[in-house]
Interface confidence: low
């Protein structure tokens, strides 16, 4: 079996708190960077990433990026600070407990990205239209 794996290390000089002043500790995300994927034309996919990482920056969330071009499909799984753009896009759905893929405009490829704020939430990426922002579950802000 493959042994336990990779940790991205990021700067952090602050403690993040929720609205009640409780310390928000780093969450767990799938973190395989960019890997080839067989996920295509499905309502949802598992990341098939065996790497579970602690996001060392407490405000970081889980992110998944699905890209398809003429040659291949890749899935990127990382931790990222939602205050900062990722692939030049703002993480608009960072408070969601589920990773709901949204298409972004990128020349020469099909590009979907999602972000979420529950442990290992980028392990299950969802493309289905039935999930949308009117779903009350997606409005939950999960504080670790």
């Amino acid at each position: 079996t493959i042994p336990p794996h990779v940790q991205k290390s990021v700067n952090n000089d602050m403690i993040v708190t929720d609205n009640n002043g409780a310390v928000k500790f780093p969450q767990l995300c799938k973190f395989c960077d960019v890997r080839f994927s067989t996920c295509d034309n499905q309502k949802s996919c598992m990341s098939n990433c065996s790497i579970t990482s602690i996001c060392e920056k407490p405000q970081e969330v889980c992110v998944a990026v699905w890209r398809k071009n003429d040659e291949n499909i890749t899935l990127e799984t990382v931790c990222h600070d939602p205050k900062l753009p990722y692939h030049d896009f703002i993480l608009e759905d960072a408070a969601s407990p589920k990773c709901i893929m949204k298409e972004k405009k990128k020349p020469g490829e099909t590009f979907f990205m999602c972000s979420c704020s529950s442990d290992e939430c980028n392990d299950n990426i969802i493309f289905s239209e039935e999930y949308n922002t009117s779903n009350p579950d997606l409005l939950l802000v999960i504080f670790q």
Epitope: I2, P4, H5, V6, S9, N11, V23, D33
Partner: antibody
Framework: EVQLVESGGGLVQPGGSLRLSCAAS????????MTWVRQAPGKGLEWVSV????????YYADSVKGRFTISRDNSKNTLYLQMNSLRAEDTAVYYC???????????????WGQGTLVTVSS | DIQMTQSPSSLSASVGDRVTITCRAS??????LNWYQQKPGKAPKLLIY???SLQSGVPSRFSGSGSGTDFTLTISSLQPEDFATYYC?????????FGQGTKVEIK
């Protein structure tokens, strides 16, 4: 068996350069973040730098920022530390270490090399 | 950066003694606290991670406790091979800072 073997240490004059290497074996190198930690003679441990498994993310201690560069060659299972503009205070044993990688062990360095001594002196 | 303060800086003990070393963080680090043992001329060795989890292969006489800012490493019955320097390290944020070390010497 996990093994980390450092090399490249030695005596160098202030302002000089040195490149340390760390040969890794016994584990899937490219999916582990790796760190350099140093220890001045008779002193405690000081974290120097970290690089992610893919090599795409690097961070440095303020004391070495702009002078040291961490890198890795995953095809050779080797970690590097390029040290430029060396100062007397950089004199230390330099250890390469693997960051453990499962949930809470993620921040801990679970395997260390034997270290290589860097002496900066005129 | 988060400062880590260990106490005492050194202690003398006999084989069979119960030894306690404390580590205090300058801010809350949850359970992101690791303990290492280092013998002269050797590399550090991971003993405890996540404040209380025993690293594989480490004798059960070593234990860790604490969360937030205050942590403890306990050796329940000191053995001859335990005379060494012990370091705490926080891995809550980068840079992952170390304590200054506690040297355990033979009385």
């Amino acid at each position: 068996e996990v093994q980390l073997v450092e090399s490249g240490g030695g005596l160098v004059q202030p302002g000089g350069s040195l490149r340390l290497s760390c040969a890794a074996s016994g584990f899937y190198f490219d999916i582990y973040a790796m760190t350099w930690v140093r220890q001045a003679p008779g002193k405690g441990l000081e974290w120097v730098s970290v690089i992610s498994g893919s090599g795409g993310t690097t961070y440095y201690a303020d004391s070495v920022k702009g002078r040291f560069t961490i890198s890795r060659d995953n095809s050779k299972n080797t970690l590097y530390l390029q040290m430029n503009s060396l100062r007397a205070e950089d004199t230390a044993v330099y250890y390469c270490a693997r960051r453990g990688q499962y949930r809470h062990i993620a921040g801990a360095t679970d395997y260390w090399g034997q270290g290589t001594l860097v002496t900066v002196s005129s | 950066d988060i400062q880590m303060t260990q106490s005492p800086s050194s202690l003398s003990a006999s084989v069979g003694d119960r030894v306690t070393i404390t580590c205090r963080a300058s801010q809350s680090i949850s359970s992101y606290l690791n303990w290492y043992q280092q013998k002269p001329g050797k590399a550090p060795k991971l003993l405890i991670y996540a404040a209380s989890s025993l690293q594989s292969g480490v004798p059960s006489r070593f234990s860790g406790s604490g969360s937030g800012t205050d942590f403890t490493l306990t050796i329940s019955s000191l053995q001859p091979e335990d005379f060494a320097t012990y370091y705490c390290q926080q891995s809550y944020s980068t840079p992952p800072t170390f304590g200054q070390g506690t040297k355990v010497e033979i009385k």
